[in-house]
């Protein structure tokens, strides 16, 4: 796969990826409740990181928002802020990598700054969607735990003591949110593997040149006052200049063929 | 005005089938699920079941599984039970009635009294 | 099924006297996800059908005189009519809107002096 295809691949697995995030973040149905083997009601609850929500058969749905900061758990809060650096990250990632595509110009910038610019946005699409996959873990984690643990109050004989009326818990299972974020956070991360992959090739290959001391023949590079520098296709203003005129070559191609320099 | 027509008495003879009718007018059939309520003479209110007009899905009380059948109709905006293999103890005045807030029904038919007797 | 009690089965009033009415469910009504008590009730006149007065245990369905109140939480509920009228002369079911089969209460009989 050529570096303009991989790095674009990247780009927009990436920035699918990172729609997932944001949508995973918002949506309200990150717990449902569980209707397997429970007293079935008429009502359906479901949450979010913001807000819980109830559907009655009715078809009235109520969201309310957590409108408290402090009343919330700290696992719900630490989701909350992996999932927002997540975001965040995901933004400054697409801002960086928009700038590093090789199919876009912009100024005079060579290539060894978009590498750079190119390896950057893929690891912060790297580091979001880790953080996402981890945000999303944790509350997963956290409804297991809890699920496990209304299991054990249900059947336990808290509601069955005699004389007693029973009350029913509520138990709550994965709700969507978790699948898209998941499926998110890894598309992202793969989108940021694949923009390091095209980082490298985008790199020129500065150990061919090292120690060497090398001259272009006569017939192979026509002069240019500026010399050499001007000539290797590394100059701040030449990329584009057509330096050598034997047959079609490929822009990637101009940056990993020092062989068609006679070494001394 | 939201109206809930149904059909007048029924009189049906023991191990029959009846189906009653239960026509909405005034909003939208299939926003709002309908439910059945049954009650025998000069007793308590029971709940059959329910149905969703947008997709057919139905909840039923077990107590009236394999009894009654709920279905719609969208084209007509109408709701039908079917009643089958009717005993003595099917005599009973059957309403549909509209769901609402808090599940509640704010909206009932008139009723459709059916007589089992041979 | 979730049982609902209700008591008295029958009472009678003096118009312009206040009545209450209880209803007991056999698990709470009270839902985590709202905080929202799925408890209704009705009034049934003779030969008509049943008229919802409150719903969500203590919400006044709209044209219902005020004169009728709903509380109560969780499995313990009431009905109030602050002065009884004569035309208020009815059963009062509740209702269980919370679990699958819904359920009704056998009713309280309201008869006038």
């Known amino acids: 796969m050529s570096v303009t295809a991989c790095q674009g691949l990247g780009f927009v697995v990436s920035l699918i990826g990172f729609a997932g995030i944001i949508a995973a973040t918002c949506m309200d149905q990150w717990s449902t409740q569980d209707l397997y083997n429970n007293p079935v009601t008429a009502v359906f609850n479901y949450q979010g990181l913001w807000r819980s929500c109830v559907r009655e058969s009715s078809g009235f749905t109520e969201c309310r928002g957590y409108f408290t900061l402090l009343g919330l758990p700290a696992m719900l809060q630490a989701v909350r802020a992996l999932m927002i650096v997540g975001i965040v990250l995901g933004v400054i990632g697409i801002l960086v990598s928009i700038f590093a595509l090789k199919c876009i110009r912009i100024g005079s910038m060579d290539d060894s700054a978009k590498a750079k610019m190119t390896l950057t946005s893929g690891i912060l699409f790297i580091i979001s969607g880790i953080s996402a996959i981890i945000g999303v873990s944790v509350f997963a984690n956290m409804l297991v735990t809890n699920f496990w643990m209304s299991t054990a109050n249900m059947y336990s004989g808290m509601g069955g003591m005699g004389g007693m009326v029973q009350t029913v818990q509520t138990r709550y299972t994965f709700g969507a949110a978790l699948f898209v974020g998941w499926v998110a956070g890894g598309l992202t991360l793969i989108g940021g593997v694949m923009m390091c992959i095209a980082c490298r090739g985008l790199t020129p290959d500065d150990s061919n040149f090292k120690a060497v001391s090398y001259h272009a023949s006569g017939q192979n590079v026509a002069y240019r006052p500026g010399g050499f520098k001007a000539s290797t296709g590394f100059g701040s203003n030449t990329r584009n200049k057509k330096i050598y005129d034997g047959g079609a070559r490929t822009e990637d191609d101009e940056q990993s063929h020092p062989t068609k320099y006679d070494y001394v | 005005e939201v109206r809930l027509q149904q059909s007048g008495p029924e009189l049906v003879k023991p191990g029959a089938s009846v189906k009653i009718p239960c026509k909405a007018s005034?909003?939208?059939?299939?926003?709002?699920?309908m439910d059945w309520v049954k009650q025998s003479h000069g007793k308590s209110l029971e709940w059959i079941g329910e149905i969703n007009p947008n997709n057919g899905g139905t909840i039923y009380n077990q107590k009236f599984k394999g009894k009654a059948t709920l279905t719609v109709d969208k084209s007509s905006s109408t709701a039908y039970m079917e009643l089958r293999s009717l005993t003595s103890e099917d005599t009973a005045v059957y309403y549909c009635a509209r769901i609402y807030y808090g599940n509640s029904f704010a909206y009932w038919g008139q009723g459709t009294l059916v007589t089992v007797s041979s | 099924d979730i049982v609902m009690t209700q008591s008295p089965s029958s009472l009678t009033v003096t118009a312009g006297e206040k009545v209450t009415m209880s209803c007991k469910s056999s698990?709470?009504?009270?839902?985590?996800?709202?905080?929202?008590?799925?408890l209704t009730w009705y009034q049934q006149k003779p030969g008509q059908p049943p008229k919802l007065l409150i719903y969500?245990?203590?919400t006044r369905e709209s044209g219902v005189p005020d004169r009728f109140t709903g509380s109560g939480s969780g499995t313990d509920f009431t009905l109030t009519i602050s002065s009884v009228q004569a035309e208020d002369l009815a059963v009062y079911y509740c209702q269980n809107d919370y679990f699958y089969p819904l359920t009704f209460g056998a009713g309280t009989k309201l008869e006038i002096k």
């Open positions: 005034g909003y939208k059939f299939t926003d709002y699920n």
């Open positions: 698990q709470s009504l009270l839902n985590s996800g709202n905080l929202k008590n799925y």
């Open positions: 969500w245990a203590s």
